[in-house]
Amino acid sequence: GPVPPYTALKELIEELVNITQNQKAPLCNGSMVWSINMTAGVYCAALESLINVSGCSAIEKTQRMLSGFCPHKVSAGQFSSLLVRDTKIEVAQFVKDLLRHLRKLFHQGTF
């Protein structure tokens, strides 16, 4: 599919940075989400995992942004091979891991 543009990925990274920096209380009340395989289909995988968190305004913009990088519709309760369904981590840790990976992609130029 189309390659996510440089500036759009930068916006997504900035939003994740914003979340990690502004975090005071436990992010999303400490909600847990499935880990994802960062090596393939990271955008859809991240959306599939985060879409199951509801009522957390802090990550709503991230969820929306991720949908712009994923070609198919993602719904809550939807599971694919992109999710590592034997490990759950806190949303805060998930966001940090995703941020680290996207920064790596950004600097490598492999958007």
Epitope: P5, T7, A8, E11, S67, P71, S75
Partner: antibody
């Protein structure tokens, strides 16, 4: 605060041309897709055209294909709609709309709308 | 071309529930959005991703989407909810808006 300000509307004769502009502020313009949506008097909403973010793809409704051209100048934070061969049925309020991010921007939801500019095609 | 069909009008008493449907072929496979438009004003996004509310939109607005039908529900409808409502989806490289529904709050 995200703001969109349309201009360029007016009265034009059938077969004539008009160029609409939309000045954007309050967000990283180049990252976001942008659309034009119109509304004829007393009628519903009709999408006209979209321009993706830095990906550069353009999309058009069948009703305007070949007559209208969407473009953008990221250095000026401005979206344009060049309208040629105008017809009476093109009479409408034209809204500039902020779309989403990424190649599948249409998944995002049209968040921010301008106030609109009125185009009247009449002899 | 893809079409989204809505009832032309829906009437509701204050405090009651209004439901607006939007029908289109396999609409449940796509993300549906809903817009509210009051006379003389620009449209406002009230639901995206089938059921998500943008910040600032009251909780009384909710949405669902499955099969061929998306539904916008306004619970505890207030006089200020009187407006035109449009559904929207993306199909084959074009946005499609529904035909629009005028919601009238009685009394």
């Amino acid at each position: 605060e995200v703001q969109l300000l349309e201009s360029g509307g007016g009265l034009v004769q059938p077969g004539g041309s008009l160029r609409l502009s939309c000045a954007a502020s309050g967000f990283t313009f180049s990252s976001y897709a942008m659309s034009w949506v119109r509304q004829a008097p007393g009628k519903g909403l009709e999408w006209v055209s979209a321009f993706s973010g830095s990906g550069g793809s353009t999309y058009y409704a069948d009703s305007v294909k070949g007559r209208f051209t969407i473009s953008r100048d990221n250095s000026k934070n401005t979206l344009y709609l060049q309208m040629n061969s105008l017809r009476a049925e093109d009479t409408a309020v034209y809204y500039c709309v902020q779309d989403g991010l990424g190649p599948y921007f249409y998944n995002y939801g049209m968040d921010v709308w301008g106030q609109g500019t009125t185009v009247t095609v009449s002899s | 071309s893809y079409e989204l069909t809505q009832p032309p009008s829906v009437s509701v008493s204050p405090g009651q529930t209004a439901s607006i449907t939007c029908s289109g072929d396999k609409l449940g496979d796509k993300y549906a959005c809903w817009f509210q438009q009051k006379p003389g004003q620009s449209p406002v996004l009230v639901i995206y991703h089938d059921s998500k509310r943008p910040s600032g939109i009251p909780e009384r607005f909710s949405g669902s989407n499955s099969g061929d039908t998306a539904t916008l529900t306004i619970s505890g409808t207030q006089a200020m909810d009187e407006a035109d409502y449009y559904c929207q989806a993306w199909d084959s490289s074009t946005y499609v808006f529904g035909t629009g529904t005028k919601v009238t709050v009685l009394g």
